[in-house]
Interface confidence: low
């Protein structure tokens, strides 16, 4: 769409002339029944830009049309009129010289100001002299300047001060947004917005609140973001750390200690040795140290702005002893032995000197029984004889006053060939024992009967002591892992003690019992 080639002239066109013009115009297109409307493009306009009031469904047969400022037709507020026949635009009282009307009735307003905001009414004069009207509107907003951030405290103290940022300028009809580290504001009780979001207050600042902070101002036609602002948060000093972390040094070495405490502004450091001031530096260097340099080394950190001080004390020991003990090796003469029969020697070997050795079995310090002996400066552990309870994990530890190290563990297995109690007796063995016991009891009964029958005067005094032992489960029922929980696994040992005296007149029918025999009959109750 081009502008009108001719400038807007203040021309009065008599209605008779308009009627004559209309009569000369012939429109063959059928009239439209659609509603006359006007649309603002854009609806929100930046100040200084232009807006087009676009017309839809313009009737075909018409004399002309006229635009007015406001929501109604008011001659005093006419902007421009247009007569189709003469293609002549006539400015009205409300014309500012920035308006252009097009043959399709659309109105262009250039270099808009905020005073242009509001309603505009189009009046269409049809060839039958019936008028139609349509009203549209637009809103003019200022082009926003680049904002800036002012602060009431650019050097706040951590955990003490609050900081209020204000976004300038204070513009009307503007939305204020804030960004921290290029992120929108997090939800935090320490962040408060006020003054229509123009002021951002940080309560009780921390060292992590340095920013950067940006504010953005927005209206429907423009947005602008400030330059970033950072906070110089004063804090610290935190508790200093002394590095390196080593405690032990050899004589002749150089002692170089460095102290650091997080602080803003950076901390001022001083060193004390055994409570005596040495120097005001961050690093302490002592060449060619001796045992006399052992002691407590204090780093003192001070922040002159916060007025806070922190100290850290480190103990330094200068010694010939090795600060690192090598891992010892453990060897066994055998790792699988027979209980109550074999012995075993465990040896702990190390290349370090000036060290001591200790032994551990199932986290217990050794030796733990008379059968265990340490020899060769504790390097060898001897177990003689090995018992069932000696089975398990052994390891040794080498140490000096400043360091220690452990060997890898070694496993000692203990077997019992005669009576592998862990696995119980086979049904055949149990049957054999039961039969033997029954037979023995029967034999004894026959012998007794004989003695009683013959009524010998030189009778053996016969004492029987029949006892029943029910040992606790914990002592006698290891490794019954398939038994259901909470079910008692009882092993009953019946012990028959025979105290036999030699009969004065032995009888061939009765065997002589020369020793007390103890026979275990193991019966598992399931």
């Amino acid at each position: 769409m081009g502008h009108l080639s001719a400038p807007l002239h203040r021309v009065r066109v008599p209605w008779q002339g308009l009627l004559l013009t209309a009569s000369l115009l012939t429109f063959w297109n059928p009239p439209t029944t659609a509603q006359l409307t006007t649309e603002s493009m854009p609806f929100n306009v930046a100040e200084g830009k232009e807006v087009l009031l676009l017309v839809h469904n313009l009737p075909q047969q018409l004399f002309g049309y006229s635009w007015y400022k406001g929501e109604r037709v008011d001659g005093n507020r006419q902007i421009v009129g247009y007569a189709i026949g003469t293609q002549q635009a006539t400015p009205g009282p409300a014309n500012s010289g920035r308006e252009t009307i097009y043959p399709n009735a659309s109105l262009l307003i250039q270099n808009v100001t905020q005073n242009d905001t509001g309603f505009y009414t189009l009046q269409v004069i049809k060839s039958d002299l019936v008028n139609e009207e349509a009203t549209g509107q637009f809103h003019v907003y200022p082009e926003l300047p680049k904002p800036s951030i002012s602060s009431n405290n650019s050097n706040p103290v951590e955990d003490k001060d609050a900081v209020a940022f204000t976004c300038e300028p204070e513009t009307q009809d503007t939305t204020y947004l804030w960004w921290i580290n290029n992120q929108s504001l997090p939800v935090s009780p320490r962040l408060q917005l006020s003054n229509g979001n123009r002021t951002l207050t940080l309560l009780s600042v921390t060292r992590n609140d340095t920013g950067p902070y940006e504010c953005e101002i927005q209206n429907p036609v423009s947005a602008n973001r400030s330059d970033p602002v950072t906070l110089n948060v004063t804090y610290g000093p935190d508790t200093p750390t002394i590095s390196p972390s080593d405690t032990y040094y050899r004589p002749g070495a150089n002692l170089s200690l460095s102290c650091y405490a997080a602080s803003n502004p950076p901390a001022q450091y001083s060193w004390l040795i055994n409570g005596t001031f040495q120097q005001s530096t961050q690093e302490l260097f002592i060449p060619n140290i001796t045992v006399n340099n052992s002691g407590s080394y204090t780093c003192h950190a001070n922040n002159s702005v916060t007025g806070c001080n922190r100290t850290t004390v480190k103990t330094i020991i200068v010694t010939e002893l090795s600060p690192v003990v090598a891992k010892p090796q453990i060897k066994a003469s055998k790792t699988t032995v027979t209980g109550d029969k074999d012995s075993v020697n465990l040896t702990c070997s190390t290349n370090d000197t000036g060290i001591s050795i200790r032994w551990f079995f199932k986290n217990q310090s050794l030796p733990s029984s008379e059968r265990m002996k340490l020899s060769q400066g504790n390097t060898t552990l001897s177990i003689n004889p090995v018992k069932r309870e000696d089975a398990g994990t052994y390891w040794c530890e080498v140490f000096n006053p400043i360091s220690k190290n452990q060997s890898d563990p070694i496993m000692l297995n203990v077997n019992y060939n005669a009576l592998p109690q862990e696995n119980g007796l086979s049904p055949g063995a149990i049957a054999g024992i039961v039969i033997g016991v029954v037979a023995l009891v029967a034999l004894i009964a026959v012998a007794l009967a004989c003695f009683l029958h013959f009524g010998k005067t030189g009778r053996a005094s016969d004492q029987r002591d029949l006892t029943e032992h029910k040992p606790s489960v914990s002592n006698h029922t290891q490794d019954h892992s398939n038994d259901p929980p909470n079910k008692m696994n009882e092993v009953t040992y019946s012990t028959l003690n025979f105290e036999a005296q030699q009969p004065t007149q032995p009888t061939s029918a009765s065997p002589s019992l020369t020793a007390t025999e103890i026979i275990y009959s193991e019966v598992k109750k399931q």
């Epitope: 100040e47 100001t113 905020q114 005073n115 200022p142 300047p145 680049k146 904002p147 800036s148 002012s150 602060s151 009431n152 405290n153 650019s154 204000t166 300038e168 300028p169 204070e170 513009t171 009307q172 009809d173």
Partner: antibody, heavy 121, light 107 residues
Framework: QIQLVQSGPELKKPGETVKISCKAS????????MNWVKQAPGKGLKWMGW????????TYADDFKGRFAFSLETSASTAYLQINNLKNEDMATYFC??????????????WGQGTSVTVSQ | DIQMTQSPSSLSASLGERVSLTCRAS??????LNWLQQEPDGTIKRLIY???SLDSGVPKRFSGSRSGSDYSLTISSLESEDFVDYYC?????????FGGGTKLEIK
């Protein structure tokens, strides 16, 4: 050029009401707020508050809450200061001053010539 | 409220002399400070905005500066029309506050 022209001097009795006008020209009135400033005879300047010329919302300093009212006639690009129930201590010169863009330090970039209010029996 | 303490309240000086007026802010106001000049007839105009920026049409002998919380207006070489009243104004937070003023008199 930008101008703020205030109404003429006023002579009032205690208890009366005075309304001072400040007509702006040379700029878009609704783009900039308007401040009001009091200067008692032989004294310094005191900020009374301001009015948002876009929304019409006034803001008053603590000492000027109650009897003082800011208003607008936007179509005439005019701001008004009304003082009700005049007291002797209200005798002063009152200035309007445009509230410019604060970004450029505009705070009070253009001033009216002042309106003298005399309160006398 | 932010207090603006202006000194001196009056100052006698000679033509061509260099003078400085000072305003001290009770809180941090950043650069949000203007200097105003008031003629004997009551007319007020702004000389300096944002601490140190010169308004258009203001002679270059006027300058503004800041040192911490002290803000200064310096006139490098006094001329006869400079012997009037001067005020500072802070606008960082509401209520906006003025200094008490300095009356510059010819010696």
């Amino acid at each position: 050029q930008i101008q703020l022209v205030q109404s003429g001097p006023e002579l009032k009795k205690p208890g009366e009401t005075v309304k001072i006008s400040c007509k702006a020209s040379g700029y878009i009135f609704r783009n900039y707020g308007m401040n009001w400033v009091k200067q008692a005879p032989g004294k310094g300047l005191k900020w009374m508050g301001w009015i948002n010329t876009y929304t019409g919302e006034p803001t008053y300093a603590d000492d000027f809450k109650g009897r003082f009212a800011f208003s607008l006639e936007t179509s005439a690009s005019t701001a008004y200061l009304q003082i009700n129930n005049l007291k002797n201590e209200d005798m002063a010169t009152y200035f309007c001053a445009r509230r410019g863009w604060l970004l450029t330090g505009g705070a009070m970039d253009y001033w009216g010539q002042g309106t003298s209010v005399t309160v006398s029996q | 409220d932010i207090q603006m303490t202006q000194s001196p309240s009056s100052l006698s000086a000679s033509l061509g002399e260099r003078v400085s007026l000072t305003c001290r802010a009770s809180q941090d106001i950043g650069s949000s400070l203007n200097w105003l000049q008031q003629e004997p007839d009551g007319t007020i105009k702004r000389l300096i905005y944002a601490t140190s920026s010169l308004d258009s049409g203001v002679p270059k002998r006027f300058s503004g500066s800041r040192s911490g919380s002290d803000y200064s207006l310096t006139i490098s070489s006094l001329e006869s029309e400079d012997f009037v009243d001067y005020y500072c104004l802070q606008y960082v937070s509401s209520p906006w506050t003025f200094g008490g003023g300095t009356k510059l008199e010819i010696k």
